[in-house]
Interface confidence: low
């Protein structure tokens, strides 16, 4: 009598996640009578995948009709494959008994699952930074298999080189994750800039996945302040202008102080955007010179995006003011300068 053979012709099968996997198994003889069972893994911890005799295996169907007495094909099809299904599958013949007795196992078929990486998610720094500072962006993608993967960073289409990438776990796994951190030096022109994390994998058929982050979420462009006084009007009123330029984001509060006392507070809103994504804002203050006995110290105080206030101060001399003034006069563009206006 010829010895029973359990034949698993494929040593390995590779399937894309979501597809069905066919695991082939034939036996050389139907004698002795007894069921075929499929297991994942070997040894005492093996997992029952399909039992012809009994049980409920919704994702596993026999390729051939197992109820036919002359059927020698015990191949199975596993539907909707996920990375968790990876492993070595064994087709095992049992002799009918109480309990059934294992007779022979096939050599095993290793099922590897090609799983697409998830869409890369790019996250930026928790707090904004100003130009010339370096900020870190992190890109994460999960659930892919096999482990080989390529990740690139771009800023406005230009490839970046300052980044570190890790693929986890280091050992064998059903699926893998990638995490990469790129360091980007900010410039004042980066409000409209974008960083892109690009992931290439065998499952993507040459069409890489991309995740993006806008540098507008990471950058703060502090304003320039310029204070100017227009010519004195015939009614002894001086028009003082505070120009706040090239700032981002728009969140800005401007306060006028006269001799240290708050005169007016304004919040920036609905400002037109400059081409580079920054904003400008101009505020005016009319000072009635004849109403003041002493010199008036005017301060334009700007608080931008929750940062410490920046002040521009100057003094209007009221002791002997002529009716007409010459050209405009500007306060110096530094933190708390004072300028005397005669």
């Amino acid at each position: 009598e010829e010895e029973l053979q359990v034949i698993q012709p494929e040593k390995s099968v590779s399937v894309a996640a979501g597809d069905s996997a066919t695991l082939n198994c034939t036996v050389s003889s139907l004698i002795p009578v007894g069921p075929i069972q499929w297991f994942r893994g070997a040894g005492p911890g093996r997992e029952l995948i399909y039992n012809l005799k009994e049980g409920h295996f919704p994702r596993v169907t026999p390729v051939s009709d197992p109820t036919k007495r002359n059927n020698m094909d015990f191949s199975i099809r596993i539907s909707n494959i996920t990375p968790a299904d990876a492993g070595t599958y064994y087709c095992v013949k049992f002799r009918k008994g109480s309990p059934d007795v294992e007779l022979k196992s096939g050599a095993g078929t290793e099922l590897s699952v090609r799983a697409k990486p998830s869409a890369p998610v790019v996250s930026g720094p928790a707090v904004r930074a100003t130009a010339e500072h370096t900020v870190s962006f992190t890109c994460e993608s999960h659930g892919f298999s096999p482990r080989d993967i390529t990740l690139k960073w771009f800023k406005n289409g230009n490839e970046l080189s300052d980044f570190q990438t890790n693929v986890d776990p280091a050992g064998k796994s059903v699926s893998y994750s990638i995490r990469s951190t790129a360091r980007v030096v900010l410039t004042r022109r980066d409000v409209h800039s974008q960083v892109i994390c690009e992931v290439a994998h065998v499952t993507l058929q040459g069409d890489p996945l991309r995740g993006t982050a806008n540098l507008s979420e990471a950058i703060r462009v502090p304003p320039f302040l310029e204070v100017t006084q227009q010519s004195m009007r015939a009614d002894n009123q001086v028009n003082v202008t505070c120009q706040v330029t090239k700032f981002y984001p728009q969140r800005l509060q401007l306060t006028w102080l006269e001799n240290g006392n708050v005169s007016r507070t304004e919040m920036a809103s609905a400002l037109p955007e400059n081409k580079d994504g920054t904003y400008n804002w101009t505020s005016w203050l009319l000072v009635n010179v004849s109403a003041h006995r002493d010199d008036v110290k005017l301060t334009c105080q700007v608080e931008h995006d929750g940062q410490p206030a920046v002040n521009k101060s100057f003094s209007v001399k009221v002791s002997a003011h002529p009716k007409e003034q010459g050209s405009n006069t500007a306060a110096e563009n530094t933190g708390t300068n004072e300028r005397n206006i005669y």
């Epitope: 994702r59 169907t61 026999p62 390729v63 009709d65 099809r77 539907s79 909707n80």
Partner: antibody, heavy 118, light 107 residues
Framework: EVQLVESGGGLVQPGGSLRLSCAAS????????MHWVRQATGKGLEWVSA???????YYTGSVKGRFTISRENAKNSLYLQMNSLRAADTAVYYC????????????WGQGTMVTVSS | DIQMTQSPSSLSASVGDRVTITCRAS??????LAWFQQKPGKAPKSLIY???SLHSGVPSKFSGSGSGTDFTLTISSLQPEDFATYYC?????????FGQGTKLEIK
């Protein structure tokens, strides 16, 4: 839209042949188990044949050796070659898609009528 | 082959009624049982798979239950469009087999 459209039915004499076609749209036919089901006028449904994703084929006993199921992936089409036709084969033939999870039928075509008569 | 037996063969009911159709398999089919609805001159429509799961777009008034050899289809509140013929089918092994059908008629 996922759709199955059968064609090729008609009147044929006993012993004759006919080839039914099923054009699939909205999905890749080769990724699913595909079936032919028939229904004689005023009667119930009868499963006829199936083709699996691996090309494995199955038939009901009464058509074995006479009918051949096949598919053409390039045309996203399923076929049923019917030879040695008998009067008992007269029926509406439906093309049916088996579901991803467990081959449960989910999409049916509108059917094509086959009449075997002399 | 696995034989599928439906009962009753026909059933009269009124709009708003709750009706139950049973299907028995000649051997254990786990839960590989489907239910279909067919109206005259139309292709069957898939209602339920794996004994109790509704196909997408099928209203929740349809429900299925059972495992092994005995299964039921319940329609909770009949509407005029529900009067049709219903078939059960086993798909645990080839050849797939259908029940003979239950014709649901308006009373």
């Amino acid at each position: 839209e996922v759709q199955l459209v059968e064609s090729g039915g008609g009147l044929v004499q006993p012993g004759g042949s006919l080839r039914l076609s099923c054009a699939a749209s909205g999905f890749t036919l080769s990724s699913y188990d595909m079936h032919w089901v028939r229904q004689a006028t005023g009667k119930g449904l009868e499963w006829v044949s199936a083709i699996g994703t691996a090309g494995d084929t199955y038939y009901t006993g009464s058509v074995k050796g006479r009918f051949t199921i096949s598919r053409e992936n390039a045309k996203n089409s399923l076929y049923l070659q019917m030879n040695s036709l008998r009067a008992a084969d007269t029926a509406v033939y439906y093309c049916v898609r088996g579901g991803v999870w467990d081959d449960a039928f989910d999409i049916w075509g509108q059917g094509t009528m086959v009449t075997v008569s002399s | 082959d696995i034989q599928m037996t439906q009962s009753p063969s026909s059933l009269s009911a009124s709009v708003g009624d709750r009706v139950t159709i049973t299907c028995r398999a000649s051997q254990d089919i786990n839960n590989y049982l489907a239910w279909f609805q067919q109206k005259p001159g139309k292709a069957p429509k898939s209602l339920i798979y794996t004994a109790s799961s509704l196909h997408s777009g099928v209203p929740s008034k349809f429900s299925g239950s059972g495992s092994g050899t005995d299964f039921t289809l319940t329609i909770s509140s009949l509407q005029p469009e529900d009067f049709a013929t219903y078939y059960c089918q086993q798909y645990v092994s080839y050849p797939y087999t259908f029940g003979q059908g239950t014709k649901l008629e308006i009373k």
